[in-house]
Every structure is written in structure tokens, then in C-alpha cells.
Amino acid sequence: MAQGTLIRVTPEQPTHAVCVLGTLTQLDICSSAPEDCTSFSINASPGVVVDIAHGPPAKKKSTGSSTWPLDPGVEVTLTMKVASGSTGDQKVQISYYGPKTPPVKALLYLTGVEISLCADITRTGKVKPTRAVKDQRTWTWGPCGQGAILLVNCDRDNLESSAMDCEDDEVLDSEDLQDMSLMTLSTKTPKDFFTNHTLVLHVARSEMDKVRVFQATRGKLSSKCSVVLGPKWPSHYLMVPGGKHNMDFYVEALAFPDTDFPGLITLTISLLDTSNLELPEAVVFQDSVVFRVAPWIMTPNTQPPQEVYACSIFENEDFLKSVTTLAMKAKCKLTICPEEENMDDQWMQDEMEIGYIQAPHKTLPVVFDSPRNRGLKEFPIKRVMGPDFGYVTRGPQTGGISGLDSFGNLEVSPPVTVRGKEYPLGRILFGDSCYPSNDSRQMHQALQDFLSAQQVQAPVKLYSDWLSVGHVDEFLSFVPAPDRKGFRLLLASPRSCYKLFQEQQNEGHGEALLFEGIKKKKQQKIKNILSNKTLREHNSFVERCIDWNRELLKRELGLAESDIIDIPQLFKLKEFSKAEAFFPNMVNMLVLGKHLGIPKPFGPVINGRCCLEEKVCSLLEPLGLQCTFINDFFTYHIRHGEVHCGTNVRRKPFSFKWWNMVP
């Protein structure tokens, strides 16, 4: 039960006080008691419940006509059952007794009022009055947790605007309101109550730039909403009529959780006594609601795809046809960024990551725009953000970044359990160097901080700086599976490739050619690849790098070897000993449900079939997956990327609600 104020009574004159329903009010009967008195009794109106406890240990007893010793160990508390119809209509009489004196009476006139700030603390999508049931001042995780949720209003419901909805202090329409959380102030007071009392709604100064609150005029259009709290206004005096009244507020978050903001926002209503104009206003009562800002959540390859993104560039028509066919098979919407908008930047995966935010009443896809800012710089903000599609970005927008700040270097695992700890939304994966040096690269700290601060997908740092481009999607992917954990981790594997090529050579296919059918590309015989000592050394190094990540992933995702599939792949070390794929990197695939768009490796053709394609199909088809090999050689591969790098996917949000987990 909420804490009320302390009321001191005195026999000299009647005391007048306000008691808010649902609060426990302490009654100080000792400090002004007549000197010779040693005991007391209490009588109260039917609407008042008096509790007397004599402790320690506390022996609680509701009052009758008993007398109690007048000593500091006695605690008297009041609660009120109903709101008053008029000021002071509930009475409490304290009688003091002494051995030699007649009883002395002290009178207390109480006004019972109902004041409660309600939000969806039960996370049902509806605001229900919760007076005296739950403590709204705490926010707890888990299925039995409580606490309201706010969305960052980061979409753009007004198509004529270039800004996010939370960047203005207007409510556009009912669509805009739906992105906000409802909070209701319910009051029931005597008619004249607010001639001597005031209600003020307020937020801590440290949080005022993270939230905006609009007051709605009931029964009127949403355009009647006016801002009452926000970056410029930490408090607002409310004009409340006496009697029974409800006031609606709509609350939007302005910032995602981050290193300097844990994501909690407390809104407080304070009841002030303004009856004495000579004195400052006195706080009679406070009620608070704590909101947590919904985190940005990534979706893994195991989530059903809803929309595919790719770029149109010079001569990639065949690539786009293949992606279109795949999207149609997977029943996905397809969005193509035209040449004039992408400015010859085809790396859709690197520019953005599409996740979502969720409150009980609303789920919103949100694009996380990377700070790489190349030709696709404007695409997320101009073409992806829109009505019910939010936007967020982090990191420096001009310089100071590395290739590891592109979002080919940002992936998320499917849900996992690691040594008994559940990650029902998976874990974020990004690449890093294995130790800092003058020329090592790492994801910008602002990006790392943001990802960690979301709390619900605890990040795992992998080692990717050994690659020339340096992205985790160059050596790993996840595909859905019908058994075990519901997925398999795919890892690029030079060992597996050498084994395959050795088997083919042993069967007399040493003359078979890699890169057959590719114009202007020197073809390589299996036997030459196998006998090239330098290439072997390079791939031995690469294998060690991937194996380091393999063990890291097994440990951090709780995987067994049987959860991992090795995809045959060779690499070569280029300048500054950084690795690149030797042939199109098959692990860099587009996963659309059971339909996989895999870079066509142009491996040695044996008995009419590419042995690399055949091997990959034999590994993945038993899982119910369909492999489509896409020719990306000249349009993507030779430019240091593949199918995954050149595409992006919006996926269905998890059915699991983030607030039901315990981070």
C-alpha cells in the first residue's frame, strides 16, 4: 500500500487532513498528548479504518472501545474506505486518559480523496485501475513481473515530414497516438477540493529529455492533445475539477536505452496543499508510475521473412531476378532501391539492420541505420522509415568509423539456453579484433554500448578482424532446422573444402576446374589448388581464426558440434594478411524460411554437377531447406561481398514478449 503523510493531532484544536484512498496514513497521537495521560482510545466514522499496533512484536488490532498505553511503541495508522462527499466529512476522535484527570479529546476531520495514476502495469494492453493492489513504483522483469512499457515514437506517421514523430511536440492523428502508452489520472474528491489543493504531474530533470507526455481532452479529437511534459517541461500543474474525473495522458519515449540511460522513466503526480497563501505549497501525497522504454530487438534467420531489400545496380538484373524468384517462393514483399538512389552502393546488409520494438498494445518494426554512410546513406531514413516503421541510428555520422561498423558485422543468434540461462530472443553477435593494436579495427563503442544497453539479447564479441572486410557474415550464418535447437549454425570451413577436393582428386577428378564458365577469370584445377603450398598456409591460418570463433560460439550459445554444419570454403590472404573468399562465399547466404539464396561457387563440375553445390545441398536439404545458387560473381563477389551482403530482410517479430524474460 502506498505511503501517506503523517498526521499530528492535538487536543488544543481540531486537525483537518486529507487522506488518499489506498494509502496508509500514520497518526501521531503521542507528541501532543496531555502530560498526565497514560492511555488513549480511538473512535472513528464508519468510512475510516484505524489500526493500532503495539510492538515490537507488533500486535495488530482494529479499534473497538479498548484503551491502549500511550507510549512511543504504539503505532496508529488510518486508511479510508470511500471518498468524501464533502470536505472533512469523516471524523476520528482520540480520548486521552490519566489517573487523576478527566478524559481529554482530540478531533481529526478527514477528507478522503481518490487520486490514482494508472498505466498498463500488468502488460495486457489495457489500462486498469490498480489502486492498492500493485506497487507501480517498481518495474520487474519476467512472466510474473510488472511495470508499464513505453515505445520510442520513432516512426514517421506524417509522410510530409522528414522527422520522426518524437521529434515534434504535436500529436498528428490517432495513428500517432497508437505509438504512445496511455496513462490515466483518476480523481474523486469533494466539489470544492481543488480550491485549496493542486495536482502537479512531473518527471525527474534527468529524465525530462527522454519522454514527452500529452494531455488528451476526453471525447475530443486527438488533435486536441497538448504537450504537458517533455524536454522543456519537467512539471505541469493540472486543472482538475472536483467530483469524479478521469484525465488521459499519452506518453512517448524519446530515447532508447543506452549507456547513459537505463531505460526507466518515472512519472509522478503530486497532491499539494495550497490552502495557506502565506506559505509554500506542501506535499500531501505522491503517486508514481515507472515505465521501461522498449528495447530495440533484432530478429534471427529463423524468424519468418516478411520483406526483402536489394539494390539495382549496373548489370545486376540477373541477380535481382534470382532474388525476386526467391522472395516470391518465400511469400515476401520485395523492395528494390533504384540506382539513382543507391549511388552505386549495393551493400544493403551493411547499411541497416531491421529489428522491432514492442509494447503490449503495439509492435513496430525499427530500422537501425549504420554510421557507414556511403551511397545508401539516405535509404533507411527516406525509404524505410515511415508510418509504423521506426528509425534509430548511433555512432559518428561523419568519419571515425571502420568497416566493422557496417551491419554485415551485426548478426543475432536464434533463441538459446546456455548453462541453464535462457536467451529467448537469442544473442547479438558482432565482430571485433582479438586484441587492440594500432591498426586493429573494432565496432564503434557507441554502437557496442547501444546494443548492450538493450539488455534482452546480450551481445557476444566474435573475432572478425582477420578478414579484409571484417564482417561476421563472411564466416557464419544460421538456418532453421526441424530438430534439436530449431536451427543450425553454418560455419565456413577450409578443412571441409580441402577434404572434398582431395576426395574428388582421389576419384580421378584432379583436372576438374574451379571457375569454369566465368569469362575473363583464370580457371584453377583441383590438383593445382591442392598442391599450392601458400594457399594451404593461408587457409590453415583462416581455419584457426574460424575455430576460435567456433569454440566461442559453442560456449556463448551453448552449442554442441552436432548443432554446427561446416560449409566448404576457401580463403586467400590479401594485403596486410587479411582474408578474402577465394571463390564466392557460400555461407554469406540469404535465408528466407526454408528457401536459401546461396552464392554460386563455380566449383569444379564433376559428372555434370558442381561438387561444391552438391556437397552443400547434401548438408542442408535433409533439414527441409531448398538451396538456390545465385550467380553474384561479377556484381558482388569480385567487389568483396556476396548475396547476404547485398540484401536485407525484415522478419516477423518473436511471439515471445521481451518483458517476460529475465536478462
Epitope: 579484409s468 571484417g470 590479401k574 594485403e575
Partner: antibody, heavy 128, light 111 residues
Framework: QVQLVESGGGLVKPGGSLRLSCAAS????????VSWIRQAPGKGLEWVSF????????YYADSVRGRFTISRDNAKNTVYLQMNSLRAEDTAVYYC?????????????????????WGRGTLVTVSS | QSALTQPRSVSGSPGQSVTISCTGT?????????VSWYQQHPGKAPKLIIY???ERPSGVPDRFSGSKSGNTASLTISGLQAEDEADYYC???????????FGGGTKLTVL
Amino acid sequence: QVQLVESGGGLVKPGGSLRLSCAASGSTLSDYFVSWIRQAPGKGLEWVSFINTANTFTYYADSVRGRFTISRDNAKNTVYLQMNSLRAEDTAVYYCSSANDDVDDIVAPGRGYYMDVWGRGTLVTVSS
Amino acid sequence: QSALTQPRSVSGSPGQSVTISCTGTRGDVGRYNHVSWYQQHPGKAPKLIIYNVYERPSGVPDRFSGSKSGNTASLTISGLQAEDEADYYCSSHSRSSTPVLFGGGTKLTVL
């Protein structure tokens, strides 16, 4: 074959900044490794910085790390060298140079370590 | 003080051969086959004449040849001609935190 032209040099006070540009013609820079090399008056060559224009992989000499930033704009076919906190010892002719990354050998590293195309250079003078 | 050591100058008569040495360490010349040589005429930009120790770009006469032994690389110019008079610089990839090193340069005089 790509041709390179440097610009942006000039006189600057110590502590000042300059941005050098290296514009390419005749071929697309995204197929090339690009380095900046400088030569102080009457002195030898000193390697300054490198960028793999396909994916912004960068490296710097110890003498300029933290003060100079190499970047590129493939759409403009240009590589830049942003030079901050300039010192008198940075006075030199700055050359832009490149090596083609289109190599067909099974393994052919090393292209980024040598420069087969050079610009004519641009003079940077740091003096008060 | 350059990272790779070259003689300040060498000379030879037309038709003769000269060799310019370039001495590094086990962390650069000794470790990598990424040694290159550049020719620079006064007031001009350098020109690549040898890369990967001994390979010649197209258009460079076969009078220019490169080799390496241990931590020392060498450039040999046979059949010296007047137009060979120039400064010559060696360069190598290095394990150090500056990944490309140059020699201090050698002035070749054709007598």
C-alpha cells in the same frame, strides 16, 4: 590504366589542417589499392597511408596515426587524405599511388605493398 | 634515419652493371617477398621498376633485375644507359606498426 591527380596542397600554419584529394580517371578506383607517399624536400620517400577502396580497410604510418585520416568516395572516384594537427616535419610533396587488385593467380598478395601508378604530387608546406 | 638501409650513391659507366643493396631485418625484407624498387628522376614522380623481389612490370627493360638473400634485397642494372641516372628507392612490407617501409634512396650516377 588509371591516371591519378592530386590536389589540395598549399601553405598552412602548424596545428592547421588540409585535405588532399586524389582523383582517378581512366578506371574505377574501387578496383584499386591506394596509398599516399610523401617526400620531404631533398629527402627520401616515406609511406603515409593505405586504403583498400573496395571496403575501406585502412592503415597508417606511426608518424601520422591519429592525425591523418584516409577515406574515399567511390562515386566521385576520389581518395582523400585529411591532415590535422600539422607539423613542420609534415612539409613534403604528397604523392597518391595505386595498385590494381584484379589479379588472377591462385594466391597473389602484395599488391597493396607496391605502387605501379603515381600521380605528380602536391606540395604541402607547414610553416608559421 | 630510414628503416631500410641503402648506399647513398653508386656509379658506373655506360654498358657496365651496378648493384644497389637494400638491407632490412627479419621482420621486413627477411620475412616477406614484398620488396619493390622505384626509380625517380629529378622533379618527377617515382616509377615502379621491380615488385615482389624480382618481378618486372610491363614496359620495364629486362636490364633491371631484382633478388633477395636473407635480410638484404638487391637491384641490378646491367648495360647501364645515361637515362638510368636517377634516385632508386627500395621498399618492403614490414611486421612493424608501419607496414610499408622505404630505404633512404641511392643516387645512381652514370659516368
